[in-house]
Interface confidence: low
């Protein structure tokens, strides 16, 4: 039994501090007590802490830790969430413009093919949007369907406009002939190659960004173990039990504790680094036929060329098809009846190239540069959190978990902790199931990113498992987005003008007093915050 404390040795300071954590003083002793029931802040003498206080300190310590982790990841989380939304929207806008350019090409050059062509073009670009967002659609089928649908209209409206209505029954025959006679030359094949390569890469890029968000969200909301809670309590609060209110934990001690608490999280580091580097490799290869902006915005030109190719061969085609499809009601069309490769386009086809000053590719590179500054995010977390919580500089006159020391010694601290619990054991437990799951997902996306990276390897036709979403932002009035020039061709302007659509904001003063749950750590992309702020790739 320790001797009673001198009359002036009260727990007044501890009481006033604890009241800020927990209103009411029923748990705080008025004068120091033996504290034999304490399990974390094991006393060397009389203490101003009770078991109930200790429990409250543990809860507060774990909450503090969660908040520190969330504020540590705030900037990174905001960067990825904002960019995922911006790129997704930008890709949808590219699709919308590509559709509008294609519709305008038909309207200006082949007015007799509208509105059927608009319908087929609309369906094609809806499929493009769905594909980008993960829907299980085959790109070759999309392109084939576009040309299969267009050819009967081209044949009946442009090549043989005098056909009676009853002859419209030949549509199925014409669809079949389209492929077997290669009526569009190699243009459909060219479009398949360009579109599939560029869309696969775009899709994996979006999928990777969405997974990045999931990684941050997972680690952002980790619940720390009781062991970690005890370590944090000992570091941040046990000094109060001895009346040492102004003492800060030793920096070295903080690092040891944080490494213990975050051992599982730090295991993500290797895969996170690989994720950023693989994403960089993907982005570096997203040009020419691997750049959906370049490919889709040039499609109108390739489709135009393909129709001109048909027109050039109209004479031979009309004769051949006239014979083949004249009695299509009587007999089924059979590809075996017709010579293969009747009209093969021998000339080398150039990729339609759209000139513009600045494109999404520069935005992607900008994002990668910013992401690379977070490449050590997970390995640096313990140090970051210690540097953003109160610690004593130079490890002098600081708290080591048990007492005030003049200089921190890791060995002494470890020895002192042995009876309480083993730091090494905490590290050995391995990552939590949610962390293991996110590591598996990172491994999977890294594998995908590696197989998709250009130009080293071929783009594999992977069926990615992200779900699809219809773009839905397409105005069907093509004149709203683009005007045809006098000669019937379309001038493609700097594409960043349409990205301006993404930068509009909903002014915060539109929502007076609307601050529920809006803490500084919540600075993510939001309908109620200016998208053009902070890390906006539109600035």
């Amino acid at each position: 039994q320790p001797p009673p404390p001198p009359p002036d040795a009260t727990c007044h300071q501890v009481r006033s501090f604890f009241q800020r954590l927990q209103p009411g003083l029923k748990w705080v002793p008025e004068t120091p007590v033996p504290g034999s029931d304490l399990q974390v802040c094991l006393p060397k003498g009389p203490t101003c802490c009770s078991r109930k206080m200790e429990e409250k300190y543990q809860l507060t310590a774990r909450l503090n830790m969660e908040q520190l982790l969330q504020s540590a990841s705030m900037e990174l989380k905001f960067l990825i969430i904002q960019n995922a939304a911006v790129f997704q929207e930008a890709f949808e806008i590219v699709v919308r413009h590509a559709k509008n350019y294609t519709n305008a090409m038909f309207k200006n050059n082949y007015p007799s093919l509208t509105p059927q062509a608009f319908e087929f073009v609309g369906e094609f670009f809806t499929d493009v949007s769905l594909y980008i967002l993960g829907s299980d659609i085959n790109v070759d089928d999309m392109v084939n369907e576009l040309f299969d649908s267009l050819f009967p209209v081209i044949y009946t409206q442009l090549m043989n406009p005098g056909l009676p209505d009853s002859a419209l029954d030949i549509n199925e025959c014409l669809r079949g002939a389209r492929r077997d006679l290669k009526v569009f030359g190699n243009f459909p094949k060219l479009i398949m190659t360009q579109v599939s390569k560029s869309l696969q890469v775009t899709r994996i890029f979006l999928q990777a960004l969405n997974l990045g968000i999931e990684v941050i969200n997972t680690t952002d909301h980790l619940k720390f173990s009781k062991d970690c809670g005890r370590m944090l309590t000992r570091m941040w609060y046990c000094s109060y039990c001895q009346g040492l209110m102004m003492v800060k934990p030793c920096g070295g001690y903080c690092n040891v504790v944080m490494q213990g608490c975050m051992a599982g999280v730090v295991e993500i580091d290797k895969y996170w680094r690989e994720y950023i580097l693989s994403l960089e490799e993907l982005v570096n290869g997203m040009y020419r036929i691997y750049d959906m902006e370049n490919v889709l915005l040039g499609l109108f030109s390739t489709i135009h060329d393909s129709i001109q190719y048909v027109q050039k061969n109209a004479g031979k085609l009309t004769t051949t098809i006239g014979k083949l499809c004249a009695h299509s009601q009587q007999r089924q069309y059979r590809s075996a009846y017709y010579p293969e490769d009747l009209f093969i386009d021998k000339k080398v086809l150039k990729v339609a190239h759209v000139e513009h000053e600045e494109t999404l590719s520069s935005r992607r590179r900008e994002l990668i540069q910013k992401l690379k500054s977070f490449i050590s995010f997970y390995s640096a977390l313990p140090g970051y959190i210690c540097s953003h919580s109160p610690v004593a500089e130079n490890d002098t006159l600081c708290w080591n978990g048990q007492e005030l020391v003049e200089r921190y010694s890791q060995k002494a601290a470890r020895n002192g902790m042995k009876n309480q619990f083993n730091l090494h054991e905490l590290k050995m437990k391995g990552p939590e199931p949610v962390v293991s799951q996110i590591i598996d997902k990172l491994k999977h996306i890294n594998q995908l990113l590696r197989t998709m990276s250009m130009p080293k390897g071929r783009v594999l036709d992977k069926n990615l498992d992200e779900e699809g979403f219809e773009s839905g932002d397409c105005g069907d009035d093509e004149d709203e987005c683009i005007g045809g020039s006098g000669d019937g061709m379309i001038k493609v302007k700097n594409q960043l003008r349409f990205l301006a659509e993404l930068a509009y904001d909903l002014d915060v003063d539109d929502a007076p007093g609307n601050s529920q749950q809006a803490t500084p750590k919540d600075n993510e992309i939001s309908t109620f915050h200016n998208l053009g702020n902070v890390h906006s790739p539109l600035k």
Partner: antibody, heavy 120, light 112 residues
Framework: EVQLVESGGGLVKPGGSLKLSCAAS????????MSWVRQTPEKRLEWVAY????????YYPDSVKGRFTISRDNAKNTLYLQMSSLKSEDTAMYYC?????????????WGQGTLVTVSA | DVVMTQTPLSLPVSLGDQASISCRSS???????????LHWYLQKPGQSPKLLIY???NRFSGVPDRFSGSGSGTDFTLKISRVEAEDLGVYFC?????????FGGGTKLEIK
């Protein structure tokens, strides 16, 4: 195909609580702001809650502020609306709706709705 | 809050006729960024609302071209060039220029 499926509606007494859920599929849920919109028996539509893509920012009109809480679980692709201190004027069909990806969005897709009846 | 007023409350039409619905806001819907966030939704009997037109005149994907939107400032109109049976239902206008977003009271399009 985009799908939003609400559940959790039912009959509740004034002052009671109810939690609605909305399961989303067919789109990248994690990058979309989401809302709850209700339709009164008189068929008037009222926007009752908004939550940003990552779940950090929320908004409520004065009529429900302090009583309703919107939340989301991006891992489960699910949106929630916790309603407490319910009043008879909260009786309505509750729809969850995805905002377009653009800021100041419009409600691009709606669920089929779940009916909440507040009555003694 | 911005009040959205729709007229008429009910609109009886014959199939094939043109229909016109008006929507007026209590304050201008032109945002400081120049955009006007006025949208139209259709709710068919027994269904949830569906987006038809966004930002005054842009048709949402899959919406037939017989639907068109126009207007500026505080006065807006939805026109259906040739009403078809599938167009029947309640039409709502909505604004998202000002927080909170608000809806009009609805216009019921029905067969004469």
């Amino acid at each position: 195909e985009v799908q939003l499926v609400e559940s959790g509606g039912g009959l509740v007494k004034p002052g009671g609580s109810l939690k609605l859920s909305c399961a989303a599929s067919g789109f990248a849920f994690i990058t979309y702001g989401m809302s709850w919109v209700r339709q009164t028996p008189e068929k008037r539509l009222e926007w009752v809650a908004y939550i940003s893509s990552g779940g950090a920012n929320t908004y409520y009109p004065d009529s429900v502020k302090g009583r309703f809480t919107i939340s989301r679980d991006n891992a489960k692709n699910t949106l929630y609306l916790q309603m407490s201190s319910l009043k008879s004027e909260d009786t309505a069909m509750y729809y969850c709706a995805s905002l377009s990806t653009l800021v100041r969005g419009w409600f691009a897709y709606w669920g089929q709705g779940t009916l909440v009846t507040v009555s003694a | 809050d911005v009040v959205m007023t729709q007229t008429p409350l009910s609109l009886p039409v014959s199939l094939g006729d043109q229909a016109s619905i008006s929507c007026r806001s209590s304050q201008s819907l032109v945002h400081s960024n120049g955009n006007t966030y006025l949208h139209w939704y259709l709710q068919k009997p027994g269904q949830s609302p569906k987006l038809l037109i966004y930002k005054v005149s842009n048709r949402f994907s899959g919406v037939p071209d017989r639907f068109s939107g126009s207007g500026s400032g505080t006065d807006f109109t939805l026109k259906i060039s040739r009403v078809e049976a599938e167009d029947l239902g309640v039409y709502f206008c909505s604004q998202s220029t000002h927080v909170p977003y608000t809806f009009g009271g609805g216009t019921k399009l029905e067969i004469k």
